[in-house]
Amino acid sequence: SERCDDWGLDTMRQIQVFEDEPARIKCPLFEHFLKFNYSTAHSAGLTLIWYWTRQDRDLEEPINFRLPENRISKEKDVLWFRPTLLNDTGNYTCMLRNTTYCSKVAFPLEVVQKDSCFNSPMKLPVHKLYIEYGIQRITCPNVDGYFPSSVKPTITWYMGCYKIQNFNNVIPEGMNLSFLIAFISNNGNYTCVVTYPENGRTFHLTRTLTVKVVGSPKNAVPPVIHSPNDHVVYEKEPGEELLIPCTVYFSFLMDSRNEVWWTIDGKKPDDIPIDVTINESISHSRTEDETRTQILSIKKVTSEDLKRSYVCHARSAKGEVAKAATVKQKVPAPRYTVEGGGGTGGLNDIFEAQKIEWHEGGGHHHHHHHHHH
């Protein structure tokens, strides 16, 4: 056969569908690869051909469109299963061609099983609701095109295994599920089951999504730098290790990029000729507020390094903040010699072993490897 533009296996379109449910799959060529739509292609005399490779097979074979009750059919650029079977899993190819033109793409289709609580290997979309924010809704996804607008389906909503009937703050309203006020306890998987008739048969569409309750924009604040702060002085002798944690709290903000960085004498650490390492850790609260800690470390600090300015910076969609760490060179304490080896002479050794940071105002000390919150 003549050359065909082969877009290969489009793994971005990892399509998962439930066993024994209708599925309509659009040929990805018109969605992502070609600059024209199916109607244009069709009126230009191009034909769309479908074929597939079964799971764990290499052999490409035509799709059987002559199954009882038209179980598999094609309509324009859509491949229909009414319904799917487990062994429909495989790689499907749609090819657009005429005598002078050919373009094709393959995509994987996985038919998955669900249990009575709608658990399955299906990757679930996540819908974020703001905590205590007033009425918010989720909508039963990906049901367009399955039935005409004249058909009135029945929709049943579930939370986990449980049909939502008398929930005190969650109300099913057709294709929508309304949360009167969202709390952390509303986190979980919600499923809509859409039941509709077609040609004397009844079909079910099952759609599950994960609800995650997140911090409200009403409560969002600019980044808060907990460390460094005015209560901690990093006092070191040359040759010691200098460790300064920068700990920043970020309110949850939808689609916000949270950034933390250090500057040394106003420059990025990479642009300074000293051996600095920076380690970052990130933790999240239940409402996805974020705490980022970047620990700046200089293994063997010099007296030059102890004169530099160390500033922690943070930025989110809510604003930018910065805080300088107080770094000093430790003045060696005078050595007391007391007859008989008793008295306070041992204090220097204790202080030396502790390698302390002074907390001004409080008189507390922490080991240098502790994070200061």
């Epitope: 249990d115 609580c117 658990n119 939370m159 986990g160 295994c161 939502i164 008398n166 005190n168 306890s185």
Partner: antibody
Framework: QVQLVQSGAEVKKPGSSVKVSCKAS????????IHWVRQAPGQGLEWMGY????????EYAQKFQGRVTITADESTSTAYMELSSLRSEDTAVYYC????????????WGQGTLVTVSS | EIVMTQSPATLSVSPGERATLSCRAS??????LAWYQQKPGQAPRLLIY???TRATGIPARFSGSGSGTEFTLTISSLQSEDFAVYYC?????????FGQGTKVEIK
């Protein structure tokens, strides 16, 4: 560790009511449904109904509809099962069991409460 | 409602032998089936869910199989602590229902 501690044994007269409690500890009370299952002497297990404490929704088996009420108090992490119009055939051990929302089997059970209905 | 029928009602087995317990559903429950063990004076204990998945801490001698309407619980080599009553439970449809139990006793 998860524990469900039920109230003590009860002896009741026919026609009266009984209210059995089930206090949960070790795990978020609001992340689970609490089910009630009973077992008559020498008999099998019989599912009665459930409550989802976080949402206040209770559902009952048809057989017990109108006679059973399941409630929950989130502040004390305690679920209650009240059975009214008691008859001798309600003599049984009543169990509460915890079920995560996304599963449908009973992973943790209370120790059981014997309710004896006798005149 | 779905009726679960267990057989036999009583199974007499010697320690170290294999025990095979049966559970039949009046209609398909897919793999939505659990097995429990109950000893006298105790609450039931979850052994198997999803027809074949062992619950946490359950020894490997317990195994479940089947789907649809026919299910089996197998205890490969009976230990003294395994003599008890075993129940199957379907959770495919509401109301969830139990079998009447199989008593495994010492032969």
């Amino acid at each position: 560790q998860v524990q469900l501690v039920q109230s003590g044994a009860e002896v009741k007269k026919p026609g009266s009511s009984v209210k059995v409690s089930c206090k949960a500890s070790g795990g978020q009370f609001n992340d689970y449904a609490i089910h009630w299952v009973r077992q008559a002497p020498g008999q099998g297990l019989e599912w009665m109904g459930y409550i989802i404490p976080a949402y206040g929704q209770a559902e009952y088996a048809q057989k017990f509809q109108g006679r059973v009420t399941i409630t929950a108090d989130e502040s004390t992490s305690t679920a209650y099962m009240e059975l009214s119009s008691l008859r001798s055939e309600d003599t049984a051990v009543y169990y509460c069991a915890r079920v995560p929302y996304s599963t449908a089997y009973f992973d943790y059970w209370g120790q059981g409460t014997l309710v004896t209905v006798s005149s | 409602e779905i009726v679960m029928t267990q057989s036999p009602a009583t199974l007499s087995v010697s320690p170290g032998e294999r025990a095979t317990l049966s559970c039949r559903a009046s209609q398909s429950v897919s793999s939505n089936l659990a097995w429990y063990q109950q000893k006298p004076g105790q609450a039931p204990r979850l052994l198997i869910y999803g027809a074949s998945t062992r619950a946490t801490g359950i020894p490997a001698r317990f195994s479940g199989s089947g789907s649809g309407t026919e299910f089996t619980l197998t205890i490969s080599s009976l230990q003294s602590e395994d003599f008890a009553v075993y129940y199957c439970q379907q959770y495919n449809n509401w109301p969830w229902t139990f079998g009447q139990g199989t008593k495994v006793e010492i032969k």
